[in-house]
Each structure stands twice: as structure tokens, then as C-alpha cells.
Amino acid sequence: QRLPRMQEDSPLGGGSSGEDDPLGEEDLPSEEDSPREEDPPGEEDLPGEEDLPGEEDLPEVKPKSEEEGSLKLEDLPTVEAPGDPQEPQNNAHRDKEGDDQSHWRYGGDPPWPRVSPACAGRFQSPVDIRPQLAAFCPALRPLELLGFQLPPLPELRLRNNGHSVQLTLPPGLEMALGPGREYRALQLHLHWGAAGRPGSEHTVEGHRFPAEIHVVHLSTAFARVDEALGRPGGLAVLAAFLEEGPEENSAYEQLLSRLEEIAEEGSETQVPGLDISALLPSDFSRYFQYEGSLTTPPCAQGVIWTVFNQTVMLSAKQLHTLSDTLWGPGDSRLQLNFRATQPLNGRVIEASFPAGVDSSPRAAEPVQLNSCLAAGD
């Protein structure tokens, strides 16, 4: 049965994949240039064995097909994950009436576990993805998205919320991770770096990408976000890496061209509806999946993360606009708004495709280091 839709926004309203060559080894940070990534000062170190650096049934939806020549994460060379030197800068809002523990920020006081104890949990996000260690899971079917192609009206709220740019999505965007795993999209937001400094939250073999998009979904088993927080599978996030490509991305331009209007922290504007799926990679069949957490306080766990293997291409100018337009608190730019990677603590990242199979000539037999946990069976 269909749950009632939330009809009102909160009271504060007023294909895009690339065809670049796969990354070469020179694109990855080197050992000498990149000391081991440390957690920003605002987060306490979490102990763990791998402290690596840097949901009514949906109709049949034809999955997107893979584009020839687009960048694939498994094409990245296998190297030691050195992490990277940048730390997210202090970009927290300071309430005019004084600070309190709810005003978390990147890289500074208060420590996130003091804001929300869940931030010290064992199964946090983001993480470093190592394709060679991912478990190939054939049960992970292509993602299904329905209703993501929005008409221009009604308009959507785009807000600089002080720690990201967030687009609130209307009711009706349905997503399925698989049979019986159905969700409704709530909002999307971005994470980025600064000039010459990448700012994705997840990393791949220690490689940090220029930026990352998150589309946050609520399980259809729940009517409200707070009911789902901390429940396994209550929330699901689709994540994709943004990379530099030769051409302007027309889908992203519909949002990026409006950032100047919300440069001031806390400001918002209305933008015409757009094709939300065009902000994601075209290949819905190849992805990594694991259970983690929100990457900002309250850091609630039980979040199903799906990280696309294919990346999204934006022009250099677009990436610059993203990282250099918005302002955070106290005359500081809103930049480097990513959390440090968190230890897996025994979690196995699953892959919908054989990402961990070494098919190079050196291997006589394909190697698969982890077996599928048969999620969704």
C-alpha cells in the first residue's frame, strides 16, 4: 500500500557520464606527496582494524545501459592507499546567540561524538573502497529509478545550508535497490574540495575525487526520517563521484548556474524541476554497496550506501563554480566539506560486478578475495 506523501516543504522555502580515459597512475596521490590522511580535528579517531586513509512495488523500469568508454572505478590502478594531505577546513555556522553542541563543523570543535554519540560508532561513513577486496554479489541487480524526470513546475528549493548545497526533492521519486528494497528520494546534496584539492567523501584505493553527489532516500517502510534513523536499511544514499571532463554538463549547469544566488550562508532560491537521474551516472548496474552511516551528525548507522562505479563528468569551470561560489560562516568559503574516511571494522563492501577479479595477464586464475553475503536473497 502507498504511504501518505508529505505535501509540504519545510518552512524555509521561498546522462551525465564521461568518456575520458581511465585514470592513470599519475593521477593518484604519491606516497611522498601525501602523508597518511588524518581525521579532521572535529572528529575523534575511531579504533578499527582498517584505519585506511584517505524501498508498494515499483513497475518494471528499464535500467540504464553502460556507455562505451566512460571511466570505471575498477580501472584505477591498484596502489597502496596513501591518503591525502588536505583536511576539511573549519566552516561551521556560529549562531548569533552563541555556540552550542548542535553546531557541528568540519575540522574543529565540538568533536562530533559530543554532538552525537553515534559519530563514534563502529560502522561509519565514508569509507575507502578497495575494489580488489570487494565481494562480487550477483544478487545485486541494476538499480531502478522511477519518477526522477521532474517537470519544470513545481519549482524546487535549492539551499546553501552552511555545510553543503541541498536540493529538496518532491514526493514521487521512487528507487529500488532490489525486490522489496524500495525507497523514496528526499534530497540531494554535494561535497567538494577547493582549488586543486579534491573533496569527495568516499575514496577508491585512497584516491579522492574532485566532488561527490549524494541522493538521500527514505525506506517506504517508514513515514518519516526520524523513524528510520539507525534502523538497518531505513535510509539509503546513492553516491557518485564527480570528475573533470572536457565538456559542460548540462544537467549540473541547471543547478550550478544558480549558486551565485545562494552564495550567502543560509540563503535559498527556487529552481525549475529537472531530470534528477541525469545528475547520476548512466550505468545503474555496476556499483559498490555497504552499510554505513550518515556522514554528518547525527551520524546514524544502518544507512545503505550505493556508490556508482561509473563517474559523472563536469567541466573544469563547473567544478570551480561548485567549490568557489558558496560562503560558509564568518567570511569563510564553503569548501572541503567532506568527512575523513572511517575504518571498515570488518565490514565487507559488496560489488554488483566482479570488481575484485584480477583479469590482468599476470593472473593465471581470477582472484576473488571476498565472497558475497547474498544481500537481498
Epitope: 509540504e8 516543504d9 519545510s10 548542535s102 552525537s116 545550508n161 528526499l186 526520517v225 526520524d226 550518515l294
Partner: nanobody, 118 residues
Framework: QVQLQESGGGLVQPGGSLRLSCAAS????????MGWYRQAPGKQRELVAG???????NYADVVKGRFTISRDNAKNTVYLEMNSLKPEDTAVYSC????????????WGQGTQVTVSS
């Protein structure tokens, strides 16, 4: 489940002031964007003011400069300070709560009556 309880409404003369309070219980107040809405008889509900988790505020044009929204996370309460009240401000005032993660209104209070009359 979050419960919202408004208080502070009443009868006031034009030009007078009132301070409305909305006390929240049952959830982590810090992670909710809060709003004040009003509905006059025979009219649609309209946004009066909103405040985000981080203290950012916005106001309906008709109340700018007269109304001030604020929040006290220690007391799990959001306030609406209303000055220079006019007869057209007469309405039932209700507060709303929206979890920051979703951006849609999750909870409503029952409302408190504000009457501006001489």
C-alpha cells in the same frame, strides 16, 4: 515521535506584542528545522517564519521587521516574538518540525489562537 505544543497566544490590542513558544518533546530537537505558520478563518495556511538547525532564519514579507523567530536547543523550544501587531495578524499560529535530512514537514503542533483587536 515528536510532539509540539504551542503556547503564548491570546488577545492583544493593535500595536501590542506577544511571544509564542513551541515546546518539542520526543525527538532530538537539534536536528529539526522549525517553522511558524498561521491560518486565518477562511484563508489558506501561510508560512510566517522559519529557522534551520543552524539558526538561519527567513520570514514572510508581511511580518519582516515585526516578528522574530529564535530557538533554544537546550530547552527544545522555538519562539516567535511578535511586535507591532495588526488586526490582520489574527489567526491560529502553529509550529512545524522538519528533520533537516528530509526537508519536508514531519510534525505539526495543534496551534494557539492570536487575536489582535481593540
Amino acid at each position: 515521535q515528536v510532539q509540539l505544543q504551542e503556547s503564548g497566544g491570546g488577545l492583544v490590542q493593535p500595536g501590542g506584542s506577544l511571544r509564542l513558544s513551541c515546546a518539542a518533546s520526543g525527538g532530538d530537537f537539534r536536528f529539526y528545522d522549525m517553522g511558524w505558520y498561521r491560518q486565518a478563518p477562511g484563508k489558506q495556511r501561510e508560512l510566517v517564519a522559519g529557522i534551520t538547525t543552524r539558526g538561519y532564519t527567513n520570514y514572510a514579507d508581511v511580518v519582516k521587521g515585526r516578528f522574530t523567530i529564535s530557538r533554544d536547543n537546550a530547552k527544545n523550544t522555538v519562539y516567535l516574538e511578535m511586535n507591532s501587531l495588526k488586526p490582520e495578524d489574527t489567526a491560529v499560529y502553529s509550529c512545524s518540525a522538519s528533520h533537516f535530512l528530509g526537508g519536508r514537514i514531519d510534525y505539526w503542533g495543534q496551534g494557539t489562537q492570536v487575536t489582535v483587536s481593540s
